[in-house]
């Protein structure tokens, strides 16, 4: 009932709590002398379901049969309406519609750790929409039964607060959960288990790793476990990997030797525990231990390349370049590179340790036979040296690869193709494709890139250090013994018309013709490989089309003669540059008047 109900009563039959789909009879009756004043025959009783009028009747009582009530709580209120007055509330009732509890399913119990307590979970089934009480029973040895009630609205978990101990690990325990509400009760199927079935060990802790004699091959993992643990699972992986290596061990007693770790690698280690070979469950994985394995001496050999530059009649500059070893080859932090330069006939040798660079430049005589050896050193030792005989890489014309081409291949890639040299192609031992940004000054400080290609390949995709809108000088070397031949080409991965034209810096008169000199377009404005320059000229104040002269682009060329100008006529001259994508805007305009005699 929902208020004092001084004026009357509302009764509900068969009950205030009903099964979904049932019918209820609701009766509203006035108490004596509680009807309308003077007009008791005009009593009008009205029944409301929530705020909606569902029935009315003149008299002292009202009967209403109600069906189709929804799950949950429905409020009915009875009111009295008299002439010329507001409706007066008589009484009300709440009706609770629900269902009997379903059989609880999937009852399972677990004890976390040897010192933990037994907790059970189950699935309630569909909502009853009524207050439902769950009682969990656990029966076991010594004729004991523990029983605990749960008064939460949605109860699907209970912790008994009991710690099962391994005195008799094979003793059986039986759990059962019973749900009860006003409409019925239902019990789960019993779940029977032993101590070993339900105790889930705590994850191992205090994980440590030791490397005997700082060697990766003598590595032991240590940890601590609960006392009854029989089995362990170890998993480990390099920190940058997603794949785990797994090892199962029995009776490890908190230690295990690992034999397959890579040197100088950060690993993540985790361990899990179990009490019995085929009973119970694995613990959660332990917290991760992260540890770096010790260094070992480098394996593999450096990839070394070089460049020769003529200085004068007696000296040449040698620039050596090498690539870093891969992490798996370096097997540690490379502390320095050792470069040895030797004159093979005289036996003179010089050795130098290089730190922080992967290149070295020196000047040597042009005479004699020279060789270099380069190795990488970490804290444990050095790699095997890479030996190279210094030769003139482009000397053998017959070894020069033919028909070299360079084509853009997607974003920031260039496909270089060639044909084998005319000389016996089978003599080629390997090809080297070399590329560097094209700088008009031929700057030797520009980084050099190269890759090696098998003798049967006639193409290579270059992608390392390739930028869009930059022109690269590409060379293909064919190497055979102590001889080499080379061919070169310019190439870019992406191009567009240059952003500016050349800047004319001088026009000089020479024997009736003129010589135009210009400044190169800045590299960042060339937007790829230049193919041509164009020089335009026309008479000042003339509307005629300009004449032009197209010059093939050559890196070192910065001037060009023109001999078709008339004397004592003032001309306007300007220049443009072209890539395969189009022509630049005009460079600066210069006026010039040829002073020579008229023809």
């Amino acid at each position: 009932k929902i208020d004092a109900c001084k004026r009357g009563d509302v009764t509900v039959k068969p009950s205030h709590v009903i099964l979904l789909g049932s019918t209820v009879n609701i009766t509203c009756s006035l108490k004596p002398r509680q009807g309308c004043f003077h007009y008791s025959r005009r009593n009008k009783l009205i029944l409301y379901k929530f705020d909606r009028r569902i029935n009315f009747h003149h008299g002292h009582s009202l009967n209403s049969q109600v069906t189709g009530l929804p799950l949950g709580t429905t409020l009915f209120v009875c009111k009295l309406a008299c002439i010329n007055s507001d409706e007066i509330q008589i009484c009300g009732a709440e009706i609770f519609v629900g269902v009997a509890p379903e059989q609880p399913q999937n009852l399972s119990c677990i004890q976390k750790g040897e010192q933990g307590t037994v907790a059970c979970t189950w699935e309630r089934g569909r909502d009853t929409h009524l207050y439902t009480e769950y009682t969990l029973q656990l029966s076991g040895p010594k004729n004991l039964t523990w029983q605990k009630q749960c008064k939460d609205i949605y109860c699907d978990y209970l912790d008994f607060g009991i710690n099962l101990t391994p005195e008799s690990p094979e003793s059986n325990f039986t759990a059962k959960v019973t749900a009860v509400n006003s409409l019925g009760s239902s019990s789960s199927l019993p779940s029977t288990f032993t101590f070993l079935d339900i105790v889930r060990p705590l994850p191992p802790w205090d994980i440590r790793i030791k490397f005997q004699k700082a060697s990766v091959s003598r590595c032991t993992l240590y940890w601590r476990d609960e006392g009854l643990v029989l089995l362990n699972r170890l998993r480990y992986r390099p920190s940058n990997s997603r794949l785990w290596n797994m090892v199962n061990v029995t009776k490890a007693k908190g230690r295990h030797d690992l034999l397959d770790l890579k040197p100088f690698t950060e690993y993540e280690f985790q361990i899990s525990s179990k009490l019995h070979l085929y009973k119970g469950s694995w613990s959660d994985w332990s917290e991760s231990l992260r540890a770096q394995t010790p260094e070992e001496e480098p394996t593999g050999m450096l990839d070394v390349w070089y460049m020769k530059r003529h200085i004068d009649y007696s000296r040449q500059q040698i620039s050596l370049f090498w690539k870093n070893l891969s992490v798996s080859e370096a097997r540690g932090k490379i502390l320095h590179y050792q470069v040895t330069l030797q004159e093979l006939t005289g036996g003179k040798a010089m050795t130098q340790n290089i730190t922080g660079h992967t290149s070295w430049t020196t000047v040597i005589p042009r005479t004699g036979n020279w060789a270099v050896a380069v190795s990488a050193a970490n804290s444990k030792g050095s790699s095997l040296p890479t030996r190279i005989n210094i030769m003139n890489l482009c000397e053998a014309g017959l070894l020069a690869p033919r028909q070299v081409s360079a084509n853009s291949e997607g974003m920031d890639n260039i496909l270089v193709t060639w044909q084998p040299p005319r000389k016996d192609p089978s003599a080629v031992q390997e090809y080297v494709v070399e590329w560097r940004e094209l700088h008009p000054g031929g700057d030797t400080q520009v980084p050099l890139n190269w890759l090696r290609s098998r003798p049967y390949n006639v193409s290579a995709l270059i992608s390392e250090n390739i930028k869009s809108y930059i022109c690269y000088e590409i060379r293909v070397y064919a190497l055979s013994g102590d001889q080499g031949g080379c061919s070169s080409i310019l190439g870019n991965s992406k191009h567009k018309a240059p952003l500016s034209g050349p800047h004319i810096n001088a026009i000089t008169e020479e024997k009736g013709s003129i010589l135009i000199s210009w400044n190169s377009i800045p590299v960042q404005e060339q937007m790829g490989c230049l193919l041509h320059y164009r020089i335009y000229w026309k008479e000042r104040d003339s509307n005629s089309q300009p004449q032009l002269c197209e010059i093939p682009y050559r890196v070192s060329q910065n001037s060009h003669p023109i001999n078709s100008l008339q004397p004592r006529v003032t001309y306007v001259l300007w220049m443009t540059a072209l890539t395969a994508a189009g022509e630049s805007s005009h460079g600066n305009e210069r006026e010039f008047c040829l002073q020579g005699k008229a023809n």
């Epitope: 933990g116 040895p141 010594k142 523990w146 029983q147 607060g161 710690n163 099962l164």
Partner: nanobody, 129 residues
Framework: QVQLQESGGGLVQAGDSLRLSCAAS????????VGWFRQAPGKEREFVSA????????IRDDSLRGRFTLSRDNAKNTVYLLMNSLKPEDTAVYYC??????????????????????WGQGTQVTVSS
């Protein structure tokens, strides 16, 4: 310090019912385990049932076949042992015992006499045939 006082014992016929009370003074039961034991003449004191007051957990000896049930009255700080279908072999002195609730108990700790810290004087129950 908890003082325990049992009451409600007496002489009954076989098949009758009896309700024993265990009232605590000096402290409320709300953080305690309350157990009932009995001791028949010439026998060891044996466990009957126990109640963990704070979380409504009950522990019973199944050999009693569910004839004995525990209840409590918070306002009176009292635990009751309702005994139905009494038999002559139920004749014994019935004791009430208490212990401060530990974080976790073992399976059979509640049935061990030595585990409890406080005991009442006992109340005699005699069942005649």
């Amino acid at each position: 310090q908890v003082q325990l006082q049992e009451s409600g014992g007496g002489l009954v016929q076989a098949g009758d019912s009896l309700r024993l009370s265990c009232a605590a003074s000096g402290r409320t039961f709300d953080t305690y385990i309350v157990g009932w034991f009995r001791q028949a003449p010439g026998k060891e004191r044996e466990f009957v049932s126990a109640l963990s007051w704070s979380d409504d957990t009950t522990i019973r000896d199944d050999s009693l076949r569910g004839r004995f049930t525990l209840s409590r009255d918070n306002a009176k700080n009292t635990v009751y042992l309702l005994m139905n279908s009494l038999k002559p072999e139920d004749t014994a002195v019935y004791y009430c015992a208490a212990k401060a609730k530990p974080p976790a108990a073992t399976w059979s700790s509640y049935r061990n006499r030595e585990w409890y810290d406080y005991w009442g004087q006992g109340t005699q129950v005699t069942v005649s045939s």
